[in-house]
């Protein structure tokens, strides 16, 4: 008889994924010569030994604590680009301007892009079948705290500029949910951190307005600065051209608005 | 494999204290997990704690606290403890062992005599 | 603290036979079990942790199975070097503990 398991809302563990996060830890590793110390399986042990036998609804930071020990990685503070519904650009541009860093440019970010993993209580499976679903399930899942746990000791190291980019294509740019907007906003440090420069990124070629005066970067600008940060913003018309420029900075054609 | 080497054998006065050291060639010492370990004839093994040398962290069994003091030089790689206010009871084999789940390279003990 | 029984003290056996040193958790510790091998006058040797999962460079005669309380070491095809004593321990909760320890005689 088939033993009843819970059934959630989400996908499950992608598959092969203990493979996957050992494979991508000794490609990292061998690729960054600053974190050839990092011992990969290690790495697997505290991530497995994070949510593997626990509830997948109670799931916390502290769960993850000897994975965060592991992947203590330095990244010049002054060059973190944080992003909100707009990865594979940000991805795009931190690949082209090498010396700026998304969190998926670090270590423990590299591991978990795109990956969807979770356990069941009391046994060692991990759980294919299904995981739970931030808003149908609960938050508390072991992907959301990852994510949550990470982003947070990421804008907490961030100094003096910090960039934002944003998808100037969504009904709500500064979505407060998001990762950026409950998590990495907040958790900024004021006494580090100068500026907060958000870079709207606009959709249509055609698309001339000033999406720095929309309400939710008011919003986005207002929060801010009641965290002593100034803020600043800028229209990316053109993000075709925009990594271009980033790739070309002499081409002529880039001395103009973007 | 490598080596976690610990000095030889310690003869100490009962209330007096001593610091054994447990030095590795390993590169990865910052991020791994460094448990003491105690044996004593015919009592198997007992978890005193551990340290993470890469930002000092320590988690002690409740029955070593005030006991024992772990900590750890990155620079030279070698991780220490103290022992305090011995008494014969503390007359044991002491190991270092790398590891958090399970440990997987053991130092070879010291063994430590409190005798007056 | 949990506590983890190794109820025969003693076991013995002869090379070639098959052996199975057994682990009981007075707790549910999952899978979070190493087991070590100690040979006389020498430090510990980790065999197999997460209750199942073979150390680097550790002959596979020895394997290690279970999950919850109950948990078993099995060494096959046993050889005279296999004389030794060997520990559980449970790595789930704090502290760390390990079992009191069986010694593999050799007939």
């Known amino acids: 008889v088939p033993r009843w398991r819970q059934q959630w809302s989400g996908p499950g563990t992608t598959k092969r994924f203990p493979e996957t996060v050992l494979a991508r830890c000794v490609k990292y590793t061998e690729i960054h010569p600053e974190m050839r110390h990092v011992d990969c399986q290690s790495v697997w042990d505290a991530f497995k030994g994070a949510f593997i036998s626990k509830h997948p609804c109670n799931i916390t930071e502290e769960d993850y604590q000897p994975l965060m020990k592991l992947g203590t990685q330095t990244v010049p503070c002054n060059k973190i680009l944080l992003w909100s519904r707009i990865k594979d650009l940000a991805h795009q541009f931190t690949q082209v301007q090498r010396d700026m860093f998304t969190l998926e440019d670090t270590l423990l970010g590299y591991l978990a892009d795109d990956l969807t993993w979770c356990g069941e209580f009391n046994t060692s499976k991990i759980n294919y079948q299904s995981c739970p679903d931030w808003r149908k399930d609960c938050s508390n899942n072991p992907v959301s705290v990852f994510w949550k746990t990470v982003s947070r000791r990421f804008a907490e190291a961030a100094c003096d500029v910090v960039h934002v980019m944003l998808n100037g294509s969504r009904s709500k740019i500064f979505d407060k949910n998001s990762t950026f907007g409950s998590v990495e906003v907040h958790n900024l440090q004021p006494e580090k951190v100068q500026t907060l420069e958000a870079w709207v990124i606009h959709g249509g070629r055609e698309d001339s307005r000033d999406l720095c005066q929309d309400p939710t970067i008011k919003e986005l600008e207002s929060i801010i600065s009641k965290r002593n940060i100034q803020f600043s913003c800028k229209n990316i018309y053109r993000p075709d051209k925009f990594l271009q420029c980033v790739k070309n900075p002499e081409d002529s054609s880039c001395t103009s608005e973007i | 494999q490598v080596q976690l080497q610990q000095p030889g054998p310690e003869l100490v006065k009962p209330v007096a204290s001593v610091k054994i050291s447990c030095k590795t060639s390993?590169?990865?010492?910052?991020?791994?997990?460094m448990n003491w370990v105690k044996q004593r004839p015919g009592k198997g093994l007992e978890w005193i704690g551990w340290?993470?040398?890469?930002?000092?962290?320590?988690n002690y069994n409740g029955k070593f606290k005030g006991k024992a003091t772990l900590t750890a030089d990155k620079s030279s790689s070698t991780a220490y403890m103290q022992l305090s206010s011995l008494t014969s009871e503390d007359s044991a084999v002491y190991f270092c062992?790398?590891?958090?789940?399970?440990?997987?390279?053991w130092g070879q003990g010291t063994s430590v005599t409190v005798s007056s | 603290d949990i506590v983890m029984t190794q109820s025969h003290k003693f076991m013995s056996t002869s090379v070639g036979d098959r052996v199975s040193i057994t682990c009981k958790a007075s707790?549910?510790?999952?899978?979070?079990v190493a087991w070590y091998q100690q040979k006389p006058g020498q430090s510990p040797k980790l065999l197999i942790y997460?209750?199942?999962s073979r150390h680097t460079g550790v002959p596979d005669r020895f394997t290690g199975s279970g999950s919850g309380t109950d948990f078993t070491l099995t060494i096959s095809n046993v050889q005279s070097e296999d004389l030794a004593d060997y520990f559980c321990?449970?790595?789930?909760?704090?502290?760390?503990?390990f079992g009191s320890g069986t010694k593999l005689e050799i007939k």
């Open positions: 062992a790398r590891g958090r789940w399970g440990m997987d390279n």
């Open positions: 390993d590169y990865a010492f910052s991020s791994s997990w």
């Open positions: 340290i993470y040398p890469g930002d000092g962290d320590t």
């Open positions: 707790q549910n510790v999952v899978t979070a």
């Open positions: 997460w209750a199942s």
């Open positions: 321990q449970q790595y789930s909760n704090y502290p760390f503990t």
